[in-house]
Every structure is written in C-alpha cells, then in structure tokens.
Interface confidence: medium
C-alpha cells in the first residue's frame, strides 16, 4: 500500500481467483483512543472499532472510502484504491491502445518545435468518475523538471455505437535550451483513477523524435507567363524554432488531382518556393519536416491549382 | 535568413557540403547497424546515450546562434578555452566564438576518428565478421578534418591488448553511432547558420 | 465575446476546390476547439469537421472524408481555422458556418458558444 496524495492510497493486488489478498491497516487521524467506529462509503453497517481498523483487501468491494467516527461526528477519511496486477502485468483497463506507433502505446506526445513545449494526449471509452494526473521530468534518476498543466478533455467522437474521448495535456521544460543535445529522455507519467481502480501509465521519449512541425504558412501560387507551370512560394510556420538557418526545414510538395487514383507529383526542396506543372482540378499541397533530423512530417497545408 | 539555401556555393563555405555528407554517412551507418544487429540493443530507446566528447570541448555551447545566446538556459557552461583559424572560413571576417566553435567541432571529428578507428579493428578480428564500419564515414570524417584544416596532433590510434569482447564492442558501436548522428546533427546546423550568416 | 469571420465561399462547378479560412478574435487564445458545420438548403445544420483545442487532433463527416481537409494557424495568439474543399459535389452546396469552443471538440451544435454569420458555397456547372 502507498499513499497516492493525502488521504488517497493505492492497494497493489495480484488479481486471480481466490487470490489471498492485501492486509491493510488504516490508523484515523485523531489524538481521540476511544469510542471510534468505521464506516465504509455510504453505508451506516460498523465495521469496527478502535483507533486502528484491520481489513483484507481483495476485490473493488473491499475498496473505497473508509471513516472514522466519534460520537456522530467524522474524524478522518481514508479512501483505497485497487491497482490490479494479472500475470505480472499492471491492468491498462482505462485508456485505450492506439497502436501507433507500435502495440501498447496509451499515451501519444508531439512537439512543434525545440522550446521544451510537448502536448501528449490519451484516449478513453469511461466517460464518467474518472480523473487522471499528470507529472513530467527529464531523466528519472536525477529528475529535471518539467511543469505540467490540468489534463482536460479535448474532444469527444463517435466510433461506431461507442463513444470515444480523448483527454490532452500540455507540458514544458522548465529551463530547456533549443540548441541542447538531449542525453536523458522525457518522462511523462499519468495517473488515472476511474472509480475505485488505479492505473499508471508511462512514456518516454527525446524531444527530437516527437517533433511534428505546424504545416508551411502564407501557401501561394504565382502562374509563370506562357507557361502550365507556377510557382508555389510558402514561409515557415510561426511555431518553428528560430533562428531558421539553424533550425532548417526540409519540403514535400505535391500535385494531386481531384481523383485518388490519379498520380502524384512529388517534389522535395529545402527551398520555401518550387515551379510546378499545376493541372486542372488538381492542389497543390506542401508539408515540413525538419532537415536534419527525420522525424514527423507535418500535415499538409493546401491550394487549389485554380 | 528565412530562406535556407539549397545547393551552396562551395567555395563560399565548403564545410556545408561536407557537413551534409557527413551526416548522411553516419544515418546510413546507424541505419545498417540496427538492421545487422537486430539481436543487440541497438534501439535509440535502448541504448545508454553517452557523449564521448563531455567535459573535452563545448561544441553545443561554442556554436550556439547568437539568437540564442539570450536563452539563460542556454548559458549554462560556456566555455572559452581555445582559438585558431580554420580555412572554411574563407576570407570572412573570423570573430573569436566562430573560430572556437569550428575548432571544438574539430575536436569532436578527431575523438570519433580515433574510436571508430579503434572499433574498427577490434571488428575486423570478429570470426562472425557480422558489421564492419563503412569506409565512407571514415573517409567524410577525414574530409571534413581537412576542410576545417585545424593544426593538432595527431593522436595515436588505441590499441589494447586484451582479448576484445565482440558483444561488448558491437554495443559501443550502437552508443557511438546515436551519439555521433546527433553530433552531426548540431554540425550540420551549424555550418548551414554560419553559411547564411 | 469571440468574433468569428468566414471567407472564402463562393461558386465553383463541380470537381473544383474551395478554401475557406475563418479568423477568431475578441479574446487571445489558441488552446480552441473549432469546427465547421453547413446548412443545405432545405436541410438542419449538420457537422463536417474539427480541430480538437490543444492536441489539434481531427475528425470529419463520413460524407467529406477524403475530399476535405481541416487545418489551423495558432499564429501570435489568434486562431485561423481553414477548410481546404476539394473535390466538390453538387450536394456540398450550402451556407458554412465556423464555431469555436473553448471546451472540447464534439461534433454536437450546442457544445459550441461561438458561431460565424457563415459564407455561402454554391457547386454548379
């Protein structure tokens, strides 16, 4: 058992049936000795008495909020929480996989540019008793920190009969270089609690992998005298890191015509313009990836060719 | 300085083009070296990020653009500790924090030589000759030394001699190859600031 | 108060593209739910798309998946949200409307306080 903030403690399990359980001692907080009694929940059943309560945690009814009482009037409060652990392995019953970039990935993190500013975002199916808590470091050994704002929910969709919500957080370095040379990775750690059961979840990562660039700003097209051709000219996002000399971008462009199956023209430039056969019906799409160091590309930003 | 240039003049600042080079050399390195050695943790997740040239010379900090230089963040460890002219800077006018960040990139270039040159016979002695270092990425290394044209001495190739343990030396390789593509990474950052400077 | 401005309506024959842009300002921020839903003549205003606040994430009607793309510019603390149509069928004809939320992204009306005039898109040859 281990305290998750004041009064709230995690009960570690190992879930099987007929498993035996956890003994928990709970101590209420008074310089009272005698004439308590226990309560849990809502319930007015006693379920002992004294200072100190013994209980064998097993299942989530031996979960939830127990009180210590005197004479009618409440003591202290501590309420337990059940963290299922089933062949080893921690229950991920909360959030959702979203087996990108690869299996057993619940959390999601992208930066646009070097500033230490990350956002990292999580998908669930629970839609009510649930809060999640979200603490962040560099390196974990001799943590650097790294402040994390209130998790809130940032968008709610439907996916087939279900409803899917998708809960968002955005964290910075407290005193991040955008030049610096990363050794030790992020750590974002959340904390979720959906009724009486606790999970964690982790991810890992160096800023450099988890760059995703806004698309190119100010798209253009400037049609070249007696000529199919234009000039499509665009400017870094306002969001890159400066100055952009250092912080170079690479482009994609590409010609797309209205039909999916048509082929697509690609160019690649580490210029902000490129000439283009523009055809009919077709856009021109154009997107940014840092020049040097291959992570996400950005999506893309688009024009019609008319 | 919005507009990055794509091909440059060579004769303007020759140590962009070798930069890129350098670059691709150890990408393609590592690449290969993830794929030959899919057995070994080899993985940027895990492997243990070290940086063989810590506390030896201050690239990161010795070539900070000068927009940056108000990041106190940034400040944490400049050091000033040595000057010389190189000839990539052509007939530019040389400032002191130039010529120091070009020499500690030198400096950088000369460590790794000497590693990879180190690990390299230590490979070639492996009966499984499974990876061996690319001779490009030695040879771009040796290019970028001389465009730089720093005056050092030479330091002698190490050898040891001790039984090598394969495993333990195919592993450095993995450490060595992140930590240098990240290294070449801030290079070729450098040399593309200091062309459009 | 948020003002929401639409641009960028107007008549294309079908097959052709369309940008619609719709700029947010009144109050400075980017961490905004924003969307674009239309009304066809005849018919209630229904969902086409949004940008989730903060994660940006997106999400489309069945009906422009693939032929329609939302995107936003956070630039100096003001929020574009465009629209880029292509592909565009008869049956897109109608008055768009950009809304904005500093709540979450959902592809429900009501979550939304803030609604542009909207700009009418007429698909005709």
């Known amino acids: 058992i281990w305290e998750l903030k004041k009064d709230v403690y995690v009960v570690e399990l190992d879930w099987y049936p007929d498993a035996p359980g956890e003994m928990v001692v709970l101590t209420c907080d008074t310089p009272e000795e005698d004439g308590i009694t226990w309560t849990l929940d809502q319930s007015s059943e006693v379920l002992g008495s004294g200072k100190t309560l013994t209980i064998q945690v097993k299942e989530f009814g031996d979960a939830g909020q127990y009180t210590c009482h005197k004479g009618g009037e409440v003591l202290s409060h501590s309420l337990l929480l059940l963290h299922k652990k089933e062949d080893g392995i921690w229950s991920t019953d909360i959030l959702k996989d979203q087996k990108e970039p690869k299996n057993k990935t619940f959390l999601r993190c992208e930066a646009k540019n070097y500033s230490g500013r990350f956002t990292c975002w999580w998908l669930t199916t629970i839609s009510t008793d649930l809060t999640f808590s979200v603490k962040s470091s560099r390196g974990s050994s001799d943590p650097q920190g790294v402040t994390c704002g209130a998790a809130t929910l940032s968008a709610e969709r439907v996916r087939g009969d279900n409803k899917e919500y998708e809960y968002s957080v955005e964290c910075q370095e407290d005193s991040a270089c955008p030049a610096a040379e990363e050794s030790l990775p992020i750590e974002v750690m959340v904390d979720a609690v959906h009724k009486l059961k606790y999970e964690n979840y982790t991810s890992s990562f160096f800023i450099r992998d988890i760059i995703k660039p806004d698309p190119p700003k100010n798209l253009q097209l400037k049609p070249l005298k007696n000529s199919r051709q234009v000039e499509v000219s665009w400017e870094y996002p306002d969001t890159w890191s400066t100055p952009h000399s250092y912080f170079s971008l690479t482009f994609c462009v590409q010609v797309q015509g209205k039909s999916k199956r048509e082929k697509k023209d690609r160019v690649f430039t580490d210029k902000t313009s490129a000439t283009v056969i523009c055809r009919k019906n077709a856009s021109i799409s154009v997107r940014a990836q840092d020049r040097y160091y291959s992570s996400s590309w950005s999506e893309w930003a688009s024009v019609p060719c008319s | 300085r919005n507009l990055p240039v794509a091909t440059p003049d060579p004769g303007m600042f020759p140590c962009l083009h070798h930069s890129q080079n350098l670059l691709r050399a150890v990408s393609n390195m590592l690449q290969k070296a993830r794929q030959t050695l899919e057995f070994y943790p080899c993985t940027s997740e895990e492997i243990d990020h070290e940086d063989i040239t810590k506390d030896k010379t201050s690239t990161v900090e010795a070539c900070l653009p000068l927009e940056l230089t108000k990041n106190e963040s940034c400040l944490n460890s400049r050091e000033t500790s040595f000057i010389t002219n190189g000839s990539c800077l052509a007939s530019r006018k040389t400032s002191f924090m130039m010529a120091l960040c070009l020499s500690s990139i030198y400096e950088d270039l000369k460590m790794y030589q000497v590693e990879f040159k180190t690990m390299n016979a230590k490979l070639l002695m492996d009966p499984k000759r499974q990876i061996f270092l690319d001779q490009n990425m030695l040879a771009v290394i040796d290019e970028l030394m001389q465009a730089l044209n720093f005056n050092s001495e030479t330091v002698p190739q190490k050898s040891s001699l001790e039984e090598p343990d394969f495993y333990k030396t195919k592993i450095k390789l993995c450490i060595l190859l992140h930590a240098f593509r990240i290294r070449a990474v801030t290079i070729d950052r450098v040399m593309s600031y200091l062309n459009a400077s | 108060q948020v003002q929401l401005v639409e641009s960028g309506g107007g008549l294309v024959q079908p097959g052709g593209s369309l940008r619609l842009s719709c700029a947010a300002s009144g109050r400075e921020f980017t961490s905004v739910s924003m969307a674009w839903f239309r009304q066809r003549p005849g018919k209630e205003r229904e969902f086409v798309a949004f940008?989730?606040?903060?994660?940006?994430?997106?999400?489309?009607a069945d009906f422009v998946k693939g032929r329609f793309t939302i995107w936003r510019d956070n630039a100096n603390a003001k929020v574009t949200v465009y629209l880029q149509m292509n592909n565009l069928k008869p049956e897109d004809t109608g008055v768009y409307y950009c809304?904005?939320?500093?709540?979450?992204?959902?592809?429900?009306?009501?979550?939304?306080?803030?609604w542009g005039q909207g700009t009418q898109v007429t698909v005709s040859s």
């Open positions: 940008s989730a606040r903060i994660s940006e994430t997106t999400e489309y």
């Open positions: 809304a904005a939320s500093e709540g979450p992204a959902t592809i429900r009306q009501n979550t939304y306080p803030d």
